[in-house]
Interface confidence: low
Amino acid sequence: LNLAYPISPWKFKLFCGPPNTTDDSFLSPAGAPNNASALKGASEAIVEAKFNSSGIYVPELSKTVFHCCFGNEQGQNCSALTDNTEGKTLASVVKASVFRQLGVNWDIECWMKGDLTLFICHMEPLPKNPFKNYDSKVHLLYDLPEVIDDSPLPPLKDSFQTVQCNCSLRGCECHVPVPRAKLNYALLMYLEITSAGVSFQSPLMSLQPMLVVKPDPPLGLHMEVTDDGNLKISWDSQTMAPFPLQYQVKYLENSTIVREAAEIVSATSLLVDSVLPGSSYEVQVRSKRLDGSGVWSDWSSPQVFTTQDVVYFPPKILTSVGSNASFHCIYKNENQIISSKQIVWWRNLAEKIPEIQYSIVSDRVSKVTFSNLKATRPRGKFTYDAVYCCNEQACHHRYAELYVIDVNINISCETDGYLTKMTCRWSPSTIQSLVGSTVQLRYHRRSLYCPDSPSIHPTSEPKNCVLQRDGFYECVFQPIFLLSGYTMWIRINHSLGSLDSPPTCVLPDSVVKPLPPSNVKAEITVNTGLLKVSWEKPVFPENNLQFQIRYGLSGKEIQWKTHEVFDAKSKSASLLVSDLCAVYVVQVRCRRLDGLGYWSNWSSPAYTLVMDVKVPMRGPEFWRKMDGDVTKKERNVTLLWKPLTKNDSLCSVRRYVVKHRTAHNGTWSEDVGNRTNLTFLWTEPAHTVTVLAVNSLGASLVNFNLTFSWPMSKVSAVESLSAYPLSSSCVILSWTLSPDDYSLLYLVIEWKILNEDDGMKWLRIPSNVKKFYIHDNFIPIEKYQFSLYPVFMEGVGKPKIINGFTKDAIDKQQNDAG
């Protein structure tokens, strides 16, 4: 059985040269496991042997292969490596004695690359090597059989693959690709070196690639002063490595004292105690498998960190409103560290910080603490407060930076009426002063309901939010879980660290903005005269809903009135309105009865139609115009009335009907249509007329009567009548009445331009009034006639008529006006 020599762990010397024996026999590459067993377990010891290669080109030996062996530093006992079982010499035999005194030493180092893709062997000739590297041709022959019971199967010569090694002045390098799946297989290999026409062949070697990994040097080496004044050296963890690593850190501190150290750690950071001002630290780090196998990586490139004469730790603080923050300081002045008792603190070099906020951490470390911090207000381009550590005489120009941000960001969420998505909105206005920050909404969904107290969950997800024109961010959750508790907060990321706004938990089911009620109808009900509003509730949510109705007179500026409906089963409501004959605009909205969530948008407006809702409230007020001779028993009477208003007609007049009643002819009616006057012949001593208004629902029930009576027309109840012009638009009428035996119903004032038949105007006045202001356009150059008629139950009395204004008693007129 040919046994391969185990390489332990990864660095060795080979001796190739003339052996001390005359045995001419040729041995194929073989190993000596028993004698090497002591080496196998030595994980740290470097196995060294000499690869001593004989020295000159000898043509007749060009076909000869010289076999090498592992040797010690002196090249002695190379031939003594024997197989215990068979006692055969494993050293190579070379016929020519010319090589007996000559030899070449080779240093060989092999490792598995950190990214686990290549196995690399690096060879360098030791000094006094008669062969030139660049003349050399080096091949590495290898096989990767699967390991069974920790011992490789005997290698078959045909199974070996060859790689050519790249040689340069410095040495040769051989690259063997190792599939990831075979990292734990046994790599069997030997080297063939041809130089100056002479070939050398190493013994067969074996190793497991995974056990000789040389990681890449650690990256991201950086240093910072910690909050407690130590130097923290840290580097990135090598996440790609499939095994844990250990690290060796070496650093040199140059300050008042010189410290040099190399420490091995398994963490990715190391604290150097007590950083000093005005010092420099040079640091390097390398890595190796934690279990001790494999090769140390190369050292990382050196990093230098220099501390200033004033050391602040931390140098910058980013924190939130209401929190507390502390800075520490060590002050070195003219190579002397100032006692912490002599340190004073200033803010923005404008305000000395009260000493109650100082504390002495140690002889040389002073600390200042700010409590319940308020947001820093930007001062010009500075968005922070500068905190200065000073000695009693002066302040150093360096300062610490304090950024205090108001992170109380309100997040409001709304679930749409279809219950398919939840939209959350928030404004970053309070944090815009923090330049270089990014904001992100983060959330954690709890399967059911919100926790008692929402807290920032360690496993959270970011939510993509879009900045809107109004300066708010909008984030949409879709799909949603209605009964899940979404705890969310805003994370402000900055190079100084991250801040989180106070978390809030939202249950999509509790922030629903329902769809507005649909099919909204509005009408003024017949007879009852109420505004009846009806609607259909939205399909979602299924909770009980409350409704709110808003209604108002249709127009440009609607004066809305609202009405609440708390009965979830209601689909309609009847409201009292003042104007039954106006167009009302009505909208309805809804929200959950328990008060959760939001009001829906208002429904699309519904409008009432103006329709007759009751019979007219009353017939029109009317008066008459008389034609013909007063002495004659027949006179033309023209009845005049003003069109009934909507509020009196409720809401329209289809026609007017005049009812006549006389002693002789009894009662009869005349349909006037929509005219507002009627002329009839008054032929009897008494003739009573009533004007009714008729709409689609019927005739007015309350109406005005007027009786034309010959005897009553002679009854003179008005003693005096005066007219005083107050202005061109107002005339004051005053009168006195004489006591009589008739019941006076009311008075009628008539006025017109004298000597004109048309243009008569009239007003009905209560019987108890003694003075009245007539508002009209009075033309100053015209003469007016004013008449005052007493109207009795029994008929119209005799008028008092005056032509023109009363010229005397202007004073009286003014007194009366007052």
Epitope: L448, Y449, P451, D452, S453, L483
Partner: antibody
Framework: EVQLVQSGAEVKKPGESLKISCQGS????????MNWVRQAPGKGLEWMGG????????NYAQKFQGRVTITADESTSTAYMELSSLRSEDTAVYYC??????????????????WGQGTTVTVSS | QSVLTQPASVSGSPGQSITISCTGT?????????VSWYQQHPGKAPKLMIY???KRPSGVSNRFSGSKSGSTASLTISGLQAEDEADYYC??????????FGGGTKLTVL
Amino acid sequence: EVQLVQSGAEVKKPGESLKISCQGSGFTFSSYKMNWVRQAPGKGLEWMGGIIPIFGTANYAQKFQGRVTITADESTSTAYMELSSLRSEDTAVYYCARDRVVVPATSLRGGMDVWGQGTTVTVSS
Amino acid sequence: QSVLTQPASVSGSPGQSITISCTGTSSDVGGYNYVSWYQQHPGKAPKLMIYEGSKRPSGVSNRFSGSKSGSTASLTISGLQAEDEADYYCSSYTTRSTRVFGGGTKLTVL
């Protein structure tokens, strides 16, 4: 030793307010939910509400909402329960009890493992 | 009226096993495995015997066990002893993140 010590017995008139205290020791008071439970004479236990001192927010059983206020003072490790508009049916023994689960685990899930000795409250005119 | 329903009383002889049921709804017992059981001797504060449905705090005898099926939780006491005579209350976490109790069960050891 983990323990909760409550204030002494109280006699109140209807309409008055009641405030009882519960001081914790032997554990990190801030991080545990402190509950208040009452038991009327001859009746069962009734959960009133609870507070997590570190957050300072309380939640209450619907029955007591608006009438009970639970507070906590971290500096003295003391929880308080105030009940207003007392009526005769508020006569009971009032217990404070600690949740066995430390925040931020779901509070209320683990049961109440440490109880105060109880405060007897009598409401009578 | 209590939200969770327990039998008013149960009894058993020493050495026997008894079971006390506690019925709720999907909003409390049925929705969570957060049922706890308390033992209360007259004039004393309650003592936690079972939490999270079936877990025993240290110091509680393994004769006490809890289980749940649907919206009903159960407390079983095996090998009944005289000192087990007490009132037993179940309690559950609810969807409203509050706690509710059962009306209590008086256990008599005959």
